[in-house]
Structure formats: structure tokens, C-alpha cells
């Protein structure tokens, strides 16, 4: 099907009406599915709108307002999904379609195939010449429960309106027998849980149909309630992962499809990315775009999403000489600085000559997200009440691609600094280090700086800081849990490496193997938390002996094969069917009888659970992915 993007201009239009018409035509010519809103506004009376006949489906709302044409030829529009609503209420809004000072205006709605509005109401008002709209049985079209304030259809037309053709039983879109409204819901047998194609119990449409059908199967629908998978209406598209009953794990499904609007597609359109099995225009802020096997996908960021920013003297900050109060906000959420970070007195304390206020020291916390500086770090001024550079606690690499007089790290004359606290710094790729005249700085002498270097010609000048013996005398020494590799400052989180064990970046005496709120196992010298599905053990027993839900001593909830799970598989997509299991008295999961298609409480066909008139559409993912 040919898909086009909708608009969201509401009532605003181009001042040139010719342009307005051309834009409408360009948007919707040969378009079958409008992915968004269909807005038809400010169109003159003599315009050819026959191109609108191609439209079959609108995912958002339909707005028809401020027009002068006589007939709205949306003759093939079957369904308005109402994923976005006009004024947050209406899926269909038709108003003010007449010329105030003349005889032009909307007389007839050509919506003869409109049989479904999935969400939202209808507003048809102030259409001076409009006929027949008030004869339509809107309750048959509108799916959601019927709040009277959500549908307003006034008797728009003048007294000159004709009647419906006698074969239409009083409900029509226009005057002839071809204009009768087709009812697909209010005429159905009460056993039908959706729409129908006749009055008998045998005439119910499949529950996945929207807008009616020509037969009982999921392939007979006029439109789909949820998704169209190669002509069949389905609750969900074939999932990326399917449950393998042999391995008790979710495994990659090579028949997976992605949701694109209301369609299941093998591949997203080229300008879309995959996010959780859906085709989206852009990744949400908590995810980043990556390419895997030629497919652009949204992957959750482990911490903060990568964001590269210009450094001082680069790109948008080409004119800046220092980080200052007028540019510091440009560093919010940056993980990589392309260029340099420079801190001069004119930035930290302000520069009245140049209309720059002093920096609020709290704002320096923006640098906590920075992991890489590709150029140099030059600190020649720092707020007097800040005794360390812990705002750079996540800085891993100083690239030194650009150097300051041969230096990639310069810390000069900072009397208030007592420790560096560059606790994540692992590499200074190029350039020399110059840390001098910081009269209160300690801990610097415990570090073997050359381990940070990438080349043999890098040099270190560290002098005229606080004497090492004075630091030791005042107890400004590495924490006892640090190894002999040294530290960046006081505390067990500042060690270059640990004497015993580590939890995250903190050095500890021992892992929580047998006690503590969160139990752990030892992976070498690293303490790793047990899987959340493991039950916390007492009496000197290990809670787990490795990672994952298959290494628990005992399960916290249920056990599916070797894996501890939150609950037994309940509608997980398998290779060919949905997987349902029940829990035995020992809380172990076992497959339901093959006849049970909606779950069970035991092994036999008599234990099946049956939900009348509903589709089983909540399919939680409780199994383990490899």
C-alpha cells in the first residue's frame, strides 16, 4: 500500500490559496494510508479533489474546515484510527465549510465506506449547505463507548436538503441508493464481539477486523483493528524473539516483522529505524541509533546516550576562549568533547569587560557526563570552594589530538584543589602532562602516570604541589582498600585498582555472598549481583553461583526448565503458536494441553482457561533472551 505522512497544521494555512491546494494534492495524490492526520483546509469551491479517492485509512484525525468545495470525495476511506485527535477529542472534525458571503460550501460528505473510527469522536457543525450528515448512525461507526460530548452532529444543511433514498431506511451519505450507510455493528447478533457482515451468529467478523468484513476469517476484514500481516489481521506482528520450549529461552525469530503503522513489514522504510519491533522516525531520547546486520535499530543506552559536542575553539564555540556562563549550557548531556575544555579566570570568575557573568559552580556538574575529550584539558581557574575535579569523574580518555603548547593536561596554580578525583581516567593518548603550583594538591604522587600514556615520547611535569610527606602526615593518603597502584583522592572509589574486591568502581573487603540486602557471586575479584529471580538464601548458603536466572540456588518465583522466571510463559510467541504453561505445586512450569489456546491451570484439556469474546493480546516477555 502506498503510505504518506500526514500534517499537523490545524487551521493554519498558506496565504496563497493556489499553493494551499497544490500542497494538499502533492501530499495525498496516490496515497492509500495517511500515517498521521488528513487536514483539508482553505480549499476553494472549484478545485478538483478527485485525488482524495485513493485514501483508504487515516491513522490520526481527519479535519475538513474553512473550505468552499461542494463534495468531499473520500469515498474509499474505511477507517480513522484516531491515534491523534483534533483538540484531543475528535477523530473526525468537519466545520465552517461555506463561504460567508456566497452560495459555495460543502453539501455532501462522500464518506460512504467509512465504517470505523477506533478512537475519538465526531464534530460536524456550522456547514451551512451540508445535507445528510445528521441521518448517519454515528454510533455504528464510532468504536469507543458513547460519551455524548464526544459527538456533535448538528442539522447543518438548509431546509433544501433532500431525503435518503427509500432503500436506505433513513440513513445515507447522499440522495441515491448508492449512498446508503452500511451498518456493521449495531445490526449484529449479540454474540458477535465486534463487527459483522449480516444479522446472524454465523455472520460475525473475526475479532481482529475493523470496519466490517466480507466473511468470518481474519483475511476477510475490510481493515484491521491492530495489524495487517500479509492480508491477515493479527493482534501483533511476528515477534523479534520466539520462545523455544526445548531451551526454555527466547530466541531470534527469522520470520519476525516490524510494525509500521497498522502493517507488519519485513523491513522498515529506508528513512525509519526499528524501536522495539516498530518502525519509528527517530529513536526516543533514552535510546541511540545503531546499525546491526544492515538494519538501523534503537538500542537502550546503558547510562546516558552518547552525544558529541563542540569544545572550546571548535565549531559553534569557535569564538569562545574559555568555558563561561554564556556557553556552559551547551555542554549539557555531552559524553564526548570534540576539541578542548579550557577553564580560565575570565570564565570561572566572569569577565565584566566582555559582559560575561561568573559561572555558578553548581553548573560545572554538566561535565559529569563527559567520557572523552579529543583535544586537551586546560584548568587555570576553578571555583575557590571546589576542592577537586570530581565533575570529571567519568572522564576516561584525553585524546590530545590538539595540544596546548605540547600539553594535553594542564592544571596550574589551583590553591583550593586537594585531590584530582579523575577516578575513571584510563588514557592520555598524546601530549604531555603539566600539573604545577597547586599548593594543596595531594595524591598525585601515588599514581604511575606513564600507565596512562599511549606513546613513549609523552612527558610529565608535576612539581611544586603539596609535598608528599606533608600529605601523608595529614592523613591525605589512599584508602586501605586501594592497591599499590595509587589513587586519585580519598575514599574507596578513588583507587586505580583494588587490594581485594570491587563492586562497580568501589573497592570493598569482600562480596555479599552470604549476607547483605543484595546477594552476589565472585567473578574473579569483581562482585556481581545475583539475578533478581534468585531467592535470597539464609543459613550460610550461596544465593547464586554465577550470572543469569539459571544459576540460582533456588527460584524466587517459578522455574521454567533451568531458568528462574517471574511467571510461567503465558502467551509467549513460539515458532508456530503461542506458548502457555501452568505451575505445579513445586512452582515448576509445564506446558498446557495443546487444546488450550488461552492458558490453563493444569495439564489436561479440562484445565483450559477460556476468556469469552476476547483476544489474548497481552503477551508478556518473561523468558530469558540468550
Amino acid at each position: 500500500q502506498s503510505v504518506c505522512a500526514g500534517t499537523e497544521n490545524k487551521l493554519s494555512s498558506l496565504s496563497d490559496l493556489e499553493q494551499q491546494y497544490r500542497a494538499l494534492r502533492k501530499y495525498y495524490e496516490n496515497c492509500e494510508v495517511v500515517m498521521g492526520n488528513l487536514e483539508i483546509t482553505s480549499i476553494e469551491h472549484n478545485r478538483d479533489l478527485s485525488f482524495l479517492r485513493s485514501v483508504r485509512e487515516v491513522t490520526g484525525y481527519v479535519l475538513v474546515a474553512l473550505n468552499q468545495f461542494r463534495y468531499l470525495p473520500l469515498e474509499n476511506l474505511r477507517i480513522i484510527r484516531g491515534t491523534k485527535l483534533y483538540e484531543d477529542r475528535y477523530a473526525l472534525a468537519i466545520f465552517l465549510n461555506y463561504r460567508k458571503d456566497g452560495n459555495f460550501g460543502l453539501q455532501e460528505l462522500g464518506l460512504k465506506n467509512l465504517t470505523e473510527i477506533l478512537n475519538g469522536g465526531v464534530y460536524v457543525d456550522q456547514n451551512k449547505f451540508l445535507c445528510y450528515a445528521d441521518t448517519i448512525h454515528w454510533q455504528d461507526i464510532v468504536r469507543n463507548p458513547w460519551p455524548s460530548n464526544l459527538t456533535l452532529v448538528s442539522t447543518n444543511g438548509s431546509s433544501g436538503c433532500g431525503r435518503c433514498h427509500k432503500s436506505c431506511t433513513g440513513r445515507c451519505w447522499g440522495p441515491t441508493e448508492n449512498h446508503c450507510q452500511t451498518l456493521t455493528r449495531t445490526v449484529c447478533a449479540e454474540q458477535c464481539d465486534g463487527r459483522c457482515y449480516g444479522p446472524y451468529v454465523s455472520d460475525c467478523c473475526h475479532r481482529e477486523c475493523a470496519g466490517g468484513c466480507s466473511g468470518p476469517k481474519d483475511t476477510d476484514c475490510f481493515a484491521c483493528m491492530n495489524f495487517n500481516d500479509s492480508g491477515a489481521c493479527v493482534t501483533q506482528c511476528p515477534q523479534t524473539f520466539v520462545y523455544n520450549p526445548t531451551t526454555f529461552q527466547l530466541e531470534h525469530n527469522f520470520n519476525a516483522k516490524y510494525t509500521y503503522g497498522a502493517f507488519c513489514v519485513k523491513k522498515c522504510p529506508h528513512n525509519f529505524v526499528v524501536d522495539s519491533s516498530s518502525c519509528v522516525r527517530a529513536c526516543p531520547s533514552s535510546k541511540m541509533e545503531v546499525e546491526e546486520n544492515g538494519i538501523k535499530m534503537c538500542k537502550p543506552c546503558t547510562d546516558i546516550c552518547p552525544k558529541a559536542c563542540d569544545g572550546i575553539g571548535t565549531g559553534s564555540l569557535m569564538s569562545a576562549q574559555t568555558v563561561d556562563s554564556s556557553n556552559i549550557d551547551k555542554f549539557i548531556n555531552c559524553t564526548k568533547i570534540n576539541g578542548n575544555l579550557i577553564f580560565l579566570v575570565t570564565g570561572i570568575h566572569g569577565d565584566p569587560y566582555n559582559a560575561i557573568e561568573a559561572i555558578d559552580p553548581e553548573k560545572l556538574n554538566v561535565f559529569r557526563t563527559v567520557r572523552e575529550i579529543t583535544g586537551f584539558l586546560n584548568i587555570q581557574s576553578w571555583p575557590p570552594n571546589m576542592t577537586d575535579f570530581s565533575v570529571f569523574s567519568n572522564l576516561v580518555t584525553i585524546g590530545g589530538r590538539v595540544l596546548y603548547s605540547g600539553l594535553s593536561l594542564l592544571i596550574l596554580k589551583q590553591q583550593g584543589i586537594t585531590s584530582l578525583q579523575f577516578q575513571s581516567l584510563k588514557e592520555i593518548s598524546a601530549g604531555n602532562i603539566y600539573i604545577t603550583d597547586n599548593s594543596n594538591l595531594c595524591y598525585y604522587h601515588t599514581i604511575n602516570w606513564t600507565t596512562l600514556f599511549s606513546t613513549i615520547n609523552q612527558r610529565i611535569v608535576i612539581r611544586d604541589n603539596r609535598k608528599a610527606e606533608n600529605c601523608t602526615a595529614e592523613g591525605m593518603v589512599c584508602n586501605h582498600l586501594c592497591s599499590s597502584d595509587g589513587c586519585w583522592g580519598p575514599g574507596p572509589d578513588q583507587c586505580l585498582s583494588c587490594r581485594r574486591f570491587s563492586r562497580g568502581r568501589i573497592c570493598i573487603e569482600s562480596c555479599n555472598l552470604y549476607d547483605g540486602e543484595f546477594r552476589e557471586f565472585e567473578n574473579g575479584s569483581i562482585c556481581v549481583e545475583c539475578d533478581p529471580q534468585c531467592e535470597k538464601m539464609e543459613d550460610g548458603l550461596l544465593t547464586c553461583h554465577g550470572p543469569g536466572p539459571d544459576n540460582c540456588t533456588k527460584c524466587s518465583h517459578f522455574k521454567d526448565g533451568p531458568n528462574c522466571v517471574e511467571k510461567c510463559p503465558d502467551g509467549l510467541q513460539g515458532a508456530n503458536s503461542f506458548i502457555f504453561k501452568y505451575a505445579d505445586p513445586d512452582r515448576e512450569c509445564h506446558p498446557c494441553h495443546p487444546n488450550c489456546t488461552q492458558g490453563c491451570n493444569g495439564p489436561t484439556s479440562h484445565d483450559c482457561i477460556y476468556y469469552p469474546w476476547t483476544g489474548h493480546s497481552t503477551l508478556p516477555q518473561h523468558a530469558r533472551t540468550p
Epitope: A320, Q321, D351, Y353, I356
Partner: antibody, heavy 113, light 110 residues
Framework: QVQLVESGGGVVQPGRSLRLSCAAS????????MHWVRQAPGKGLEWVAV????????YYADSVKGRFTISRDNSKNTLYLQMNSLRAEDTAEYYC??????WGQGTLVTVSS | QSALTQPASVSGSPGQSITISCTGT?????????ASWYQQHPGKAPKLMIY???NRPSGVFNRFSGAKSGNTASLTISGLQAEDEADYYC??????????FGGGTKLTVL
């Protein structure tokens, strides 16, 4: 060497507008804040306005606030002063300055009916 | 933004020393070390003589010196010379991020 050349002065009626320009050369214009200072005939210096290097901060003397607008175009190395609702007391020599050292030679604005 | 207070005129003989005062408030002169002094000859643009209370730009003779006490800045010219005859203005940064000048002092070399 730093050079600042003001232009755009002239005679204008009260209530009308005028735009002064200051062409800068001999330094990296886009890295410095710039000021306007004026001096009425036979009177003392009066500071008028300042703009930061990137245009993000602007400050004005109370006497011109709401009537004058300082702006800059870093791509053209030019500073501007848009003067609206001019009054007789705005008559002065207007200097552009790179504080505190470098000043232009000034341009004369006369507000008279 | 009231102008800083300077004496309207001072005078001295060649070779003598004179001092020009500039009184403000704690919101300008007293609150910041951004007091400057400018010399202006008739028909010419102002010339910076002292910046940041006591610093001399290159090219300014060391006969010119600046100081500050409380809310008052001062400019001292020693070894007065005929070419020192001019108007002198003090200038200070203020707490509202603006700048303010003094009313000016006419120096006459007798």
C-alpha cells in the same frame, strides 16, 4: 593593530530612528564583548551598552533601556546600535569600544527638529 | 546608575603631583577591582591610563598611578607636565553588570 571605525551618525528628528555601525579589524572580533559610550557636546562620558562575544548577553544604561538595541554580526566583524524614539538629549558623539583599551574616533548624532 | 563623583577641576604646576578622587558606592567602585581612568584631550577619543584600579597599559608613563580605598578610587599624576592637561574620567563596573563613568575632572597645568 586594533581599529574601530564608527559610522551612521547624522541629523535626525526627535522620535525617529537611526542605526550606528562599528567596523572592527586587527583582532578576533568574535571573541570579545563590545561597548558603546557617548559624550554629549561639552559634557562627560556616558556608558551606553555592552554585548558579549556571542551576543548572548546585553546590558544597557537606564537612560536608553527599551529604546536602544545593541547587536553584532560576527561574520562581518561589525557592531551595531539601533536607536529608536530618539530625544534631544541623545545628541552626542557615539564611540564604540573594545573595553577597556581600544576606542574608535566616534560618530556624531544630532537629534533636532 | 548614578555617575561617580569626581572634583570638577584640579590644577598643579609642572613637576608637582596631583590626585584626582572618584567616589562611588559598594555596588560599583567599592565592590569590584574594575576601576579605570581615561584621559581625553579636546576633540579626541578617550585614552586608557589605568585599568583594574592600579594597572598601567603599555605606553603609559609610570608617572600615572592608581589606587583604591573603600568606595573611592584615585588617580595620581606625579611630575606633572604640560601635555597632561586634559579631562580625566573614572569608570567602574557595577553590580547590575553595567558600567558607570564619573562626571569628569578638568586638569589644568599652571
Amino acid at each position: 593593530q586594533v581599529q574601530l571605525v564608527e559610522s551612521g551618525g547624522g541629523v535626525v528628528q526627535p522620535g525617529r530612528s537611526l542605526r550606528l555601525s562599528c567596523a572592527a579589524s586587527g583582532f578576533t572580533f568574535s571573541s570579545y564583548g563590545m561597548h558603546w559610550v557617548r559624550q554629549a557636546p561639552g559634557k562627560g562620558l556616558e556608558w551606553v551598552a555592552v554585548i558579549s562575544y556571542d551576543g548572548s548577553n546585553k546590558y544597557y544604561a537606564d537612560s536608553v533601556k527599551g529604546r536602544f538595541t545593541i547587536s553584532r554580526d560576527n561574520s562581518k566583524n561589525t557592531l551595531y546600535l539601533q536607536m529608536n524614539s530618539l530625544r534631544a538629549e541623545d545628541t552626542a558623539e557615539y564611540y564604540c569600544a573594545k573595553y577597556p583599551l581600544n576606542w574608535g574616533q566616534g560618530t556624531l548624532v544630532t537629534v533636532s527638529s | 546608575q548614578s555617575a561617580l563623583t569626581q572634583p570638577a577641576s584640579v590644577s598643579g604646576s609642572p613637576g608637582q603631583s596631583i590626585t584626582i578622587s572618584c567616589t562611588g558606592t559598594s555596588s560599583d567602585v567599592g565592590g569590584y577591582n574594575y576601576a579605570s581612568w581615561y584621559q581625553q584631550h579636546p576633540g579626541k577619543a578617550p585614552k586608557l591610563m589605568i585599568y583594574e584600579v592600579s594597572n598601567r597599559p603599555s605606553g603609559v608613563f609610570n608617572r600615572f598611578s592608581g589606587a583604591k580605598s573603600g568606595n573611592t578610587a584615585s588617580l595620581t599624576i606625579s611630575g606633572l607636565q604640560a601635555e597632561d592637561e586634559a579631562d580625566y574620567y573614572c569608570n567602574s563596573y557595577t553590580s547590575s553588570s553595567t558600567w558607570v563613568f564619573g562626571g569628569g575632572t578638568k586638569l589644568t597645568v599652571l
